[in-house]
Interface confidence: medium
């Protein structure tokens, strides 16, 4: 009983339950392969609890091991389109600080119009994650087709 | 020591660890695109801890942010079959209550025979999730090829 | 206040936060379809907190429901290569103890060069997970293209 009461009084943040799910806002100008994300209840089902957005890129606020997941669907796409515009590749990585820059997850579209994957990775407070889409095709901004999120799993 | 004892005495349900992993039972009649699911240890490795099945659809019992994941493999399928029968699309959404109806996750098969994805989304007690497979191809019932699950992540 | 102190004193392991993320080490000899994994901070972003590696295969140390995820990318691959070498299939399963041998997750590459999926499954202490890649194509060893991991979710 004492435990249950104490648990309710503890702010969720102290349990380390940082989590975010983002929807696509826009792509960058021609020479910038990054996807720019947005999140918040006013936009629908996206949210940020802990992490923050910095110019459309996701910044981590708590050290730990995170589950990072992403799905990107190319807009108005058929397998013919996808193969004609090959290679179209998506990479998720730490883009700042520069000293920690690394690619975490990479997928090519080949003859498909959607990629989806997830992985566990250690992230540190201040790490900014970038999602780079290279190629000439544009992603769909439908919120059930393109999304990106992280979930804190353990210290 | 006191803490560990208290923790063991607390029912898991009070920690909000709702989780379910389902296997395909059957598809619906001709005009019903929904997949019908089943779960329970007697069936193999599927289970429901918290959520419930309502006529083969998954009903949520606890408010919170959930990780929803799915894999569907088409039966008797090759890339030729898949492209010939295109578009075959899978959508996971809240189908009831009607006031909360929305598509959460959508993928097309294009020239592939399997789709797999996952996302974080807020769900509320009473939300029923439906998985709609549109197109003429049928899903495999092999439990390692087609499955659907949810995991409560945080309030 | 008492609760927070107690929580900090508890070793993480007692909370059941077993987690592992592995990178590909090598493939097996000709008649062995298994992928051999490696993990640890010296290798980069891979790690084992709880589970262990036994001759390149992942052994579970704590009973519970786990989220198992994998991504495998074929090396030197195009959609033409993938379809010409079809069927190339990846299966994740319990390979020992033999009494619990079962396939948990299975995907074919068809015309794609990457597969990625995840699922919830009950695992028991001592279960060893094997990942079998059948076909003539080889997997990429790039750590952002091929990885395998598990995360303890609940008892």
């Amino acid at each position: 009983q004492r435990f249950a009461q104490a648990q309710q009084q503890l702010p969720l943040e102290s349990l380390g339950w940082d989590v975010a799910e983002l929807q696509l806002n826009h792509t960058g100008p021609q020479q910038d392969p990054r996807l720019y994300w947005q999140g918040g209840p006013a936009l629908g089902r996206s949210f940020l609890h802990g992490p923050e957005l910095d110019k459309g890129q996701l910044r981590i606020h708590r050290d730990g091991i995170y589950m990072v997941h992403i799905q990107v669907t190319l807009a108005i796409c058929s397998s013919t389109t996808a193969s004609r515009h090959h290679p179209t590749t998506l990479a998720v990585g730490i883009c700042s600080p520069a000293s920690r820059s690394i690619s975490l997850l990479r997928l090519s579209f080949h003859q498909g119009c959607t990629i989806a994957s997830q992985r566990l990775t250690p992230l540190a407070r201040g790490d900014t994650l970038c999602t780079n889409l290279t190629g000439t095709l544009l992603p769909s901004r439908n919120t059930d087709e393109t999304f990106f999120g992280v979930q804190w799993v353990r210290p | 020591q006191r803490f560990a004892q208290a923790q063991q005495q607390l029912p898991l349900e009070s920690l909000g660890w709702d989780v379910a992993e389902l296997q395909l039972n059957h598809t619906g009649p001709q005009q019903d695109p929904r997949l019908y699911w089943q779960g329970g240890p007697a069936l193999g490795r599927s289970f429901l801890h918290g959520p419930e099945l309502d006529k083969g659809q998954l009903r949520i019992h606890r408010d919170g942010i959930y990780m929803v994941h799915i894999q569907v493999t088409l039966a008797i399928c090759s890339s030729t079959t898949a492209s010939r029968h295109h578009p075959t699309t899978l959508a996971v959404g809240i189908c009831s209550p009607a006031s909360r109806s929305i598509s959460l996750l959508r993928l097309s098969f294009h020239q592939g025979c399997t789709i797999a994805s996952q996302r974080l989304t807020p769900l509320a007690r009473g939300d029923t999730l439906c998985t709609n497979l549109t197109g003429t191809l049928l899903p495999s019932r092999n439990t390692d090829e087609t499955f659907f699950g949810v995991q409560w992540v945080r309030p | 206040q008492r609760f927070a102190q107690a929580q900090q004193q508890l070793p993480l392991e007692s909370l059941g936060w077993d987690v592992a993320e592995l990178q590909l080490n090598h493939t097996g000899p000709q008649q062995d379809p298994r992928l051999y994994w490696q993990g640890g901070p010296a290798l980069g972003r891979s790690f084992l907190h709880g589970p262990e590696l036994d001759k390149g295969q992942l052994r579970i140390h704590r009973d519970g429901i786990y989220m198992v995820h994998i991504q495998v990318t074929l090396a030197i691959c195009s959609s033409t290569t993938a379809s010409r070498h079809h069927p190339t299939t990846l299966a994740v399963g319990i390979c020992s103890p033999a009494s619990r041998s079962i396939s948990l997750l299975r995907l074919s590459f068809h015309q794609g060069c990457t597969i990625a999926s995840q699922r919830l499954t009950p695992l028991a202490r001592g279960d060893t997970l094997c990942t079998n890649l059948t076909g003539t194509l080889l997997p990429s060893r790039n750590t952002d293209e091929t990885f395998f991991g598990v995360q303890w979710v609940r008892p």
Epitope: L24, H26, T27, P29, Q30, L35, P41, A42, L43, G44, R45, A75, I76, L138, P139, S140, R141, N142, T143, D144, E145, T146 | A91, G93, S101, I102, S103, R106, N132 | -
Partner: antibody, heavy 122, light 110 residues
Amino acid sequence: EVQLVESGGGLVQPGGSLRLSCAASGFTFSVYYMNWVRQAPGKGLEWVSDINNEGGTTYYADSVKGRFTISRDNAKNTLTLQMNSLKPEDTALYYCVRDAGYSNHVPIFDSWGQGTQVIVAS
Amino acid sequence: QAVVTQEPSLSVSPGGTVTLTCGLTSGSVTSDNFPVWYQQTPGQAPRLLIYTINSRHSGVPSRFSGSITGNKAILTITGAQPEDEADYYCALYLENFANEFGGGTRLTVL
């Protein structure tokens, strides 16, 4: 087959109100951004408003801002345009249009209804 | 704000080739304007023809093609057919989520 059927048009006096509706079928309505586009008699196309798939974000052309309100009901597969303080220059054929969902808020209108006529005159 | 410009009218002989242009009163059209072309035959709703410069929508014949040449977006019809007689609208993406249509080009197939 995608179908968009508009209704609610008619003759109204300047300063009056009208409510246009669009019934959608043949696709998963709740996943698409939806738009209203109008065409004055003998003139070109003018984008009026759009709404995101969940109804949380809306945009309006400057010419209608503050007077028109776009909304949607995903449970009923309907899109509506509430038009207040109507002016003679709002006279047009109003099309309900589906946005293909391209990123960058680049509207690509891949399915159109047949339109409903609105006439604002005294 | 820039205005999207199109030729008011053009004509082409059956089997001939015609080029419709789409420009801006100030500045050049670039790929960042994501040019889109729509066709509206008399008494019908518009239909999507070409999007993001040069991608043909499903069901659109291969005689229709899009490009950017110089400072304008171009719609080329190679081997025009009588059924191509219609109004053609170009739309360009401008800043602040604005999507501007041109005034349209009436194409006559003589």
